[in-house]
């Protein structure tokens, strides 16, 4: 939270590739690769749908919503077994992210 961005300074991330493809069910799958230089006590995560360095505690405890991974106006919920999270848009559309 509130750490500086720049030429990949400590505590920052940059998107390296962003691939979009469709599987047989015509379901869009986005694969985003990011490069992060996180500080001690931090680890690469997602904030406001973008790569970010987040507290390692969040990853260890799988409290994914503490990263604020969803966009403003969306609601965040943990998936069963904390295997990921869902972002629910105001219109009811749900975007699911699983962590592997």
């Amino acid at each position: 939270q509130f750490l500086k961005e720049g030429q990949l300074a400590a505590g920052t991330c940059e998107i390296v590739t962003l691939d979009r493809c469709c599987n047989k069910n015509r379901r869009t799958i986005a694969r985003q690769t990011a490069r992060c230089a996180c500080r001690k006590g931090q680890i690469a995560g997602t904030t406001r749908a973008r790569p970010a360095c987040v507290d390692a505690r969040i990853i260890k405890t799988k409290q994914w919503c503490d990263m604020l991974p969803c966009l403003e106006g969306e609601g965040c919920d943990l998936l069963i077994n904390r295997s990921g999270w869902t972002c629910t848009q105001p219109g009811g559309r749900i975007k699911t992210t699983t962590v592997s």
Epitope: R39, Q63, L68, G73, E74, G75
Partner: antibody, heavy 113, light 110 residues
Amino acid sequence: QSLEESGGRLVTPGTPLTLTCTASGFSLSTYYMSWVRQAPGKGLEWIGIVYPSGTTYYANWAKGRFTISTASTTVDLMITSPTTEDTATYFCARGDSFGYGLWGPGTLVTVSS
Amino acid sequence: ELVLTQSPSVQVNLGQTVSLTCTADTLSRSYASWYQQKPGQAPVLLIYRDTSRPSGVPDRFSGSSSGNTATLTISGAQAGDEADYYCATSDGSGSNYQYVFGGGTQLTVT
């Protein structure tokens, strides 16, 4: 989207007091919520923060003196054992990695014997 | 313990430009935010991440940061800009997370 604090009143020293911040028009699951106070004629003082999971962090000076908890649309601040130095206007604020962009109007707590 | 230092009071003539500064050891690696507070009102976020302005904030307000100093610049000061201005930043992560406000600067427009 709005925040409103309630529960501020005159209390005697040592009497626990709970303030409530009610959120309208947005989900607490996608923001950080903080409590900030301001003594009369003084500056802003951050008390603590609650994450969507319910994890809390407190200012060093506030540890043990305050407890923050959250429900579906409310965030509570309990002043465990108020002293006269806790007389202030208490604000709740909604934040993310961009700062605290939404504040309640505040609620006044007066601690006096 | 993180301390943000601001000048207690600053005076500016109507229509002139004024710069308010905030210094701290950690501002070279942590973002600064700026808040405006008028008497009897809640604070309003003016600047976040050193330089960004939320929608609705006039472009007369701008932020910058260099080294350990963050600066809020108000161009063409108006009577309505008379208020207290607070800088703030966060420090640490995990169990050490803290958010700190500066002591505030009282701006008077004459």
